[in-house]
């Protein structure tokens, strides 16, 4: 039994890091393998993660961690029984994938303005709480070409757009994702999408 693709890990910069790797053949990850991990810190202890299968030869492990700070470094040991298959380390702050925003809501009752709001996925004491920016994706269910992205570069988790920038009388969907420039993170997954029917009063033409 050998590791074909070494573990790569990403952290949500809160409490979970996810590590994925591939073996050289079909493997029952949960029965054959264990990933041991430990924060390099005087007051830390070793933890064991039981991996799950992720395709025939792929394995994935969800590591429960202490609140992350930038200096954290974890040792990783992948074991098959008594055999050490791979040894490495992981700095969560260097491989961050933020949590997805939640509670996306479209408020349509504000005088021909659409107000989209969502929740910051981090608590206020987390470093990323004040460092997230967002991308909002809006698309038409009727017209695949009607697809747009709004970049929200301010901290407030909301977006205002004129309803008239979208077509009236049809249904739209929206979703939002986040990233943090300070740690050069990847984008989060998209939030679940929300649907609304776009309608607004056309302004009277003045002759």
């Amino acid at each position: 039994m050998k590791v074909l693709q070494e573990p790569t890990c990403v952290s949500d910069y809160m409490s979970i890091s996810t590590c994925e790797w591939k073996m050289n053949g079909p493997t029952n990850c949960s029965t054959e393998l264990r990933l041991l991990y430990q924060l390099v810190f005087l007051l830390s202890e070793a933890h064991t993660c039981i991996p799950e299968n992720n395709g025939g030869a792929g394995c994935v492990c969800h590591l429960l961690m202490d609140d992350v700070v930038s200096a954290d470094n974890y040792t990783l040991d992948l074991w098959a029984g008594q055999q050490l298959l791979w040894k490495g380390s992981f700095k969560p702050s260097e491989h961050v994938k933020p949590r997805a925003p939640g509670n996306l809501t479209v408020h349509t009752n504000v005088s021909d303005t659409l107000l989209l709001t969502w929740s910051n996925p981090y608590p206020p004491d987390n470093y990323l709480y004040n460092h997230l920016t967002y991308a909002v994706n809006i698309w038409s269910e009727n017209d695949p070409a009607d697809f747009r992205i709004y970049n929200v570069t301010y901290l407030e988790p909301s977006l205002r757009i004129a309803a008239s920038t979208l077509k009236s009388g049809i249904s739209y969907r929206a979703r939002v994702r986040a990233w943090a420039q300070c740690y050069n993170t990847t984008w989060s997954e998209w939030s679940p999408s929300t649907k609304w029917h776009n309608s607004y009063r056309e302004p009277f033409e003045q002759h």
Epitope: L42, L43, E45, D66, A71, P124, D125
Partner: antibody, heavy 115, light 109 residues
Framework: EVQLVQSGGGLVHPGGSLRLSCAGS????????MFWVRQAPGKGLEWVSG???????SYADSVKGRFTISRDNAKNSLYLQMNSLRAEDMAVYYC?????????WGQGTLVTVSS | EIVLTQSPGTLSLSPGERATLSCRAS???????LAWYQQKPGQAPRLLIF???SRAPGIPDRFSGSGSGTDFTLTISRLEPEDFAVYYC??????????FGQGTKVEIK
Amino acid sequence: EVQLVQSGGGLVHPGGSLRLSCAGSGFTFSRNAMFWVRQAPGKGLEWVSGIGTGGATSYADSVKGRFTISRDNAKNSLYLQMNSLRAEDMAVYYCARGRYYFDYWGQGTLVTVSS
Amino acid sequence: EIVLTQSPGTLSLSPGERATLSCRASQSVSSSYLAWYQQKPGQAPRLLIFGASSRAPGIPDRFSGSGSGTDFTLTISRLEPEDFAVYYCQQYDHSAGWTFGQGTKVEIK
């Protein structure tokens, strides 16, 4: 807002015991290492003890064998049991959250050791 | 055990002046594990700088940290009246734990 609220200081005779408490709020207590740091009157800061999320502990040589740090994650609380107290243990004791450094501190509680 | 020595013991300056505080370690310290604190009379210490040069949340940008190895510096670019206090450096070591410097008092001249 992260808050650490301390209680339990007071006057104790040499050789006596005292228990300090620290209640945390505004953060996930169970995922953070916690510490005690003290400051003798007119002196600098001295690290006393720390406890990790899994219960691993460490002590300054000056208190080893006399002080015991503990935590109760269900109550979001940190404790310091101080036995065989000496005159040189007299100080303001601070609880703190942190790891390699201490990012939030309690208000401090004075421990006076005097006969 | 790593010993941190701060200098000067006392720094007498006027508001608006630049303050430069030194922290020297008896052996090499990882920059990731060097922090600075401010303490005012009757108050708990407040984290200013971590990782030798990163400002803690809410700390004004007139505070900056620098250095590596055994020599670290805290600089206050323009002293405000509320900056007069005692400043401590602190390091963490995987075997010895946490140690503080003896402090530098910044007082009004």
